[in-house]
């Protein structure tokens, strides 16, 4: 799996989308998990409703929400009030039994708030932004990691 980078601004909301084949994953619940270390387990953050029929219900765990458009084949995760500690590698998963298929690997990057004058040296202005209907969502941009790029900082 390639890793897709989603960038968001600290204090704002970031929306992550994970497209999938709706027929292949028909009837399967989905989950969003955080990768603990390069080879560590993926720790569940939030999952869709236990009733697959109600996957469209937005479920929250703290400041993270998940909702699944099972017809269109898009899993959407919202990270509200993005903080520096939210940065890291995540996965969108499709669940079946005790197994989980990775739908997408996601690297979340948190950028300094350009309106926060305490750190004016780190100003970041989104060059390519997507706007969403959801009022909570401000801006997010995504790209795929280039070959050879490492999602985790090298450990010393």
């Amino acid at each position: 799996h390639n890793t897709t980078v989603f960038q968001g601004v600290a204090g704002q909301s970031l929306q992550v989308s994970c497209p999938y084949d709706s027929m292949k994953h028909w009837g399967r619940r989905k989950a969003w998990c955080r990768q603990l270390g390069e080879k560590g387990p993926c720790q569940r953050v939030v999952s869709t409703h236990n009733l697959w029929l109600l996957s469209f219900l937005r479920r929250w765990n703290g400041s993270t929400a998940i909702t699944d458009d099972t017809l269109g084949g898009t899993l959407t995760i919202t990270l509200r009030n993005l903080q520096p500690h939210d940065a890291g590698l995540y996965q969108c998963q499709s669940l079946h039994g005790s197994e989980a298929d990775t739908l997408r690997k996601v690297l979340v990057e948190v950028l300094a708030d350009p309106l926060d004058h305490r750190d004016a040296g780190d100003l970041w202005f989104p060059g390519e932004s997507e706007s969403f209907e959801d009022a909570h969502v401000e801006h997010s941009i995504s790209r795929s990691l280039l070959e050879g790029e490492i999602p985790f900082p090298p450990t010393s």
Epitope: H49, N50, L53, R58, R59, L71, D134
Partner: antibody
Framework: QVQLVQSGAEVKKPGASVKVSCKAS????????MHWVRQAPGQGLEWMGI????????SYAQKFQGRVTMTRDTSTSTVYMELSSLRSEDTAVYYC?????????????????WGKGTTVTVSS | EIVMTQSPATLSVSPGERATLSCRAS??????LAWYQQKPGQAPRLLIY???TRATGIPARFSGSGSGTEFTLTISSLQSEDFAVYYC????????FGGGTKVEIK
């Protein structure tokens, strides 16, 4: 106005099956999910299952798996709940209740319209 | 399965007084909680959903609060038609109802 009209009271013997109907009117039948909830005499409410009237997909509470079947007839805007292998503990009032249908990223769920209930008595 | 516990089982209140009903979930249900009112021989009626949003046509004297595992339904000034049984229901993980609180005339 939005209405759910249920079939009349039933008296059944242990081991038999019962099929309760719930006819919807006043809204687009296929746009809202339907739930079945039961209430034993003097007891609380117990969720049994859900059906999507559009495609007919169902999910049942684990307790009723294998004994309950929910179906629908879109031509008459009616949903059905059939419970088999009846026992005395199944004596209850059975309600159909409407819940929101498939809407992307709905924040909260609920059951906003209820039928008046169908009394099912299981007795030998 | 998430267990919903309501307290008290019975609440004796005089008309015009305030009634506070409690509902506790065995694990977090976020704000996916609804309150229903049921009178003898009648079907339940939706009062509150999303823990605090009043359903259409519900009087302002009914209010809901809480999130996570602790929820409250408050009836600010009880009217004669409010004496009934009240159920909470979590809709975050399957669907389970609390055992109910009967609000009776003192």
């Amino acid at each position: 106005q939005v209405q759910l009209v249920q079939s009349g009271a039933e008296v059944k013997k242990p081991g038999a099956s019962v099929k309760v109907s719930c006819k919807a009117s006043g809204y687009t039948f296929t746009s809202y999910y339907m739930h079945w909830v039961r209430q034993a005499p003097g007891q609380g409410l117990e969720w049994m299952g859900i059906i999507n009237p559009s495609g007919g997909s169902t999910s049942y509470a684990q307790k009723f798996q294998g004994r309950v079947t929910m179906t629908r007839d879109t031509s008459t805007s009616t949903v059905y709940m059939e419970l088999s292998s009846l026992r005395s503990e199944d004596t209850a009032v059975y309600y159909c209740a409407r819940g929101p249908g498939y809407t992307t990223a709905l924040d909260y769920y609920y059951m906003d319209v209820w039928g008046k209930g169908t009394t099912v008595t299981v007795s030998s | 399965e998430i267990v919903m516990t309501q307290s008290p089982a019975t609440l004796s209140v005089s008309p015009g007084e305030r009634a506070t009903l409690s509902c506790r979930a065995s694990q977090s249900v976020s704000s996916n909680l609804a309150w229903y009112q049921q009178k003898p021989g009648q079907a339940p009626r939706l009062l509150i959903y999303g823990a605090s949003t009043r359903a259409t046509g519900i009087p302002a004297r009914f209010s809901g609060s809480g999130s996570g595992t602790e929820f409250t339904l408050t009836i600010s000034s009880l009217q004669s038609e409010d004496f009934a049984v009240y159920y909470c229901q979590q809709l975050d993980d399957w669907f389970t109802f609390g055992g109910g609180t009967k609000v009776e005339i003192k």
